[in-house]
């Protein structure tokens, strides 16, 4: 996900940094700007129930992390749900995973000092054909 | 996703903050700590092709954002793929979306000053029944 080291023409109005480790340590404004004004997250919220690979959402809370609450998907079945509402064991429900960035308090319990951390979260599930290895 | 305002016992070794807006503006170390050492991201990399609701991945690049590269899923079909490899008109491929946090350079082009931003990304696709039949 992360591509670092891009050279950006510097804006003369940028804050100055006297940090010896600059640009490893940066200032971050935690007033979140939400770019999702046009989207309605409620609209896709029932997919977890209507999918052929349905999932449950589990709350993962960690006060040392920002955001402190993350929802993790766990597939309900190993197989997928067929048209009759039964589990089809010829197909597999699998989690779709994504690496996301979070802020980890460092040193621990510090309210204003963080380190960037990459974590893998399961966002939902999809139904896939299993890989069958044919023996010669 | 975000739950703020948790009271944390302060570590006496924390950096001092003289920022008037504290704790709105915090210090973040960009040396990413990767918690995913036990996982093999390659393992889920072919789900996009094997799913009954397959998707393509599109590169979204923005040098003013950190991470600058994010991959967006676009469902290949409107319907889902059946066992014969043909479309099933009775089922729909839909994107699974997740709100993630990114860092936006603010003011623009500044290498050491960011604002937290929430964006909605499509991570993959799942196959859903279009109509939920409500029983009276």
């Amino acid at each position: 996900i992360v591509k670092a080291g891009i050279t950006i023409p510097r804006n003369p109005g940028c804050p100055n940094s006297e940090d010896k480790n600059f640009p490893r340590t940066v200032m971050v404004n935690l007033n979140i700007h939400n770019r999702n004004t046009n989207t309605n997250p409620k609209r896709s919220s029932d997919y977890y129930n209507r999918s052929t690979s349905p999932w449950n959402l589990h709350r993962n809370e960690d006060p040392e992390r920002y955001p402190s609450v993350i929802w993790e998907a766990k597939c309900r079945h190993l197989g997928c749900i067929n048209a009759d509402g039964n589990v089809d064991y010829h197909m597999n429900s699998v989690p779709i995973q994504q690496e996301i960035l979070v802020l980890r308090r460092e040193p621990p319990h510090c309210p204003n000092s963080f380190r960037l951390e990459k974590i893998l979260v399961s966002v939902g599930c999809t139904c896939v054909t299993p890989i069958v290895h044919h023996v010669a | 996703i975000v739950k703020a305002g948790i009271t944390i016992p302060r570590n006496p070794g924390c950096p001092n903050s003289e920022d008037k807006n504290f704790p709105r503006t915090v210090m973040v170390n960009l040396n990413i700590h990767n918690r995913n050492t036990n996982t093999n991201p390659k393992r889920s990399s072919d789900y996009y092709n094997r799913s009954t609701s397959p998707w393509n991945l599109h590169r979204n690049e923005d040098p003013e954002r950190y991470p600058s590269v994010i991959w967006e899923a676009k469902c290949r079909h409107l319907g889902c793929i059946n066992a014969d490899g043909n479309v099933d008109y009775h089922m729909n491929s839909v994107p699974i979306q997740q709100e993630i946090l990114v860092l936006r350079r603010e003011p623009p082009h500044c290498p050491n000053s960011f604002r937290l931003e929430k964006i909605l990304v499509s991570v993959g696709c799942t196959c859903v029944t279009p109509i939920v039949h409500h029983v009276a």
Epitope: - | L78, G79, D84, N86, V87, Y89, N92, V94, I131
Partner: antibody
């Protein structure tokens, strides 16, 4: 230039049969979903049949299911609609239409239509 | 089947007017909506798909909006060639269904 040309319409008695054809040109026919849509005189549009790019998937609404059959011959760039057990309410202009994708969900090109009249 | 209700069924407007046509689905159709224009004796012509995506070659005075069950086609400044009948079509749940049409006439 994309062109769809329907033929085979005409007057038929109730209970009779008719086969419509749609000749496609100006695009790679075998990669597009196709549909038949009809319009009764002075009325709105109604889906009749859908077929995906290779003919492996089809769909019919209840109003024609069991009486109409959609097929395609990709080697001849032609779409067909076989209509059996025709009824007065099947009277309409029949359009063939192309989906911009593989499957047949919405329609970016339409033919000029062929009129089917079911009457005794 | 999903019912598509278009309103108004007809309207009279003048060249230069802003015209709005609405389409209501009986269930959420998740933005899977197309708009067509049909002139007398002609086949329909696709204007918009995915509720908001304008087809190439369609003038920018046409725009689609909406979500859930409610969708709108707007013509920002009506031109002489826009007098026609407009249909919406959902493609979320088979059978795909069309609205009853809105006839835009010259005032």
């Amino acid at each position: 230039e994309v062109q769809l040309v329907e033929s085979g319409g005409g007057l038929v008695q109730p209970g009779g049969s008719l086969r419509l054809s749609c000749a496609a040109s100006g695009f790679t026919f075998s990669t597009y979903g196709m549909s038949w849509v009809r319009q009764a005189p002075g009325k709105g549009l109604e889906l009749v049949a859908i077929i995906n790019h290779n003919g492996g998937s089809t769909f019919y609404p209840d109003s024609v299911k069991g009486r109409f059959t959609v097929s395609r011959d990709n080697s001849k760039n032609t779409l067909y609609l076989q209509m059996n057990s025709l009824r007065a309410e099947d009277t309409a202009v029949y359009y063939c239409a192309r989906d911009p994708r593989h499957d047949g969900y919405f329609f970016d090109y339409w033919g000029q239509g062929t009129l089917v009249t079911v009457s005794s | 089947d999903i019912q598509m209700t278009q309103s108004p069924s007809s309207l009279s407007a003048s060249v230069g007017d802003r015209v709005t046509i609405t389409c209501r689905a009986s269930e959420d159709i998740y933005d899977r909506l197309a708009w067509y224009q049909q002139k007398p004796g002609k086949a329909p012509n696709l204007l918009v798909s995915g509720a908001t995506s304008l087809e190439s070659g369609v003038p920018s005075r046409f725009s689609g909006s909406g979500s859930g069950k409610d969708y709108t086609l707007t013509i920002s400044s009506l031109q002489p060639e826009d007098f026609a009948t407009y249909y919406c079509q959902q493609y979320w749940s088979v059978p795909w269904t069309f609205g009853g049409g809105t006839k835009v006439e010259i005032k």
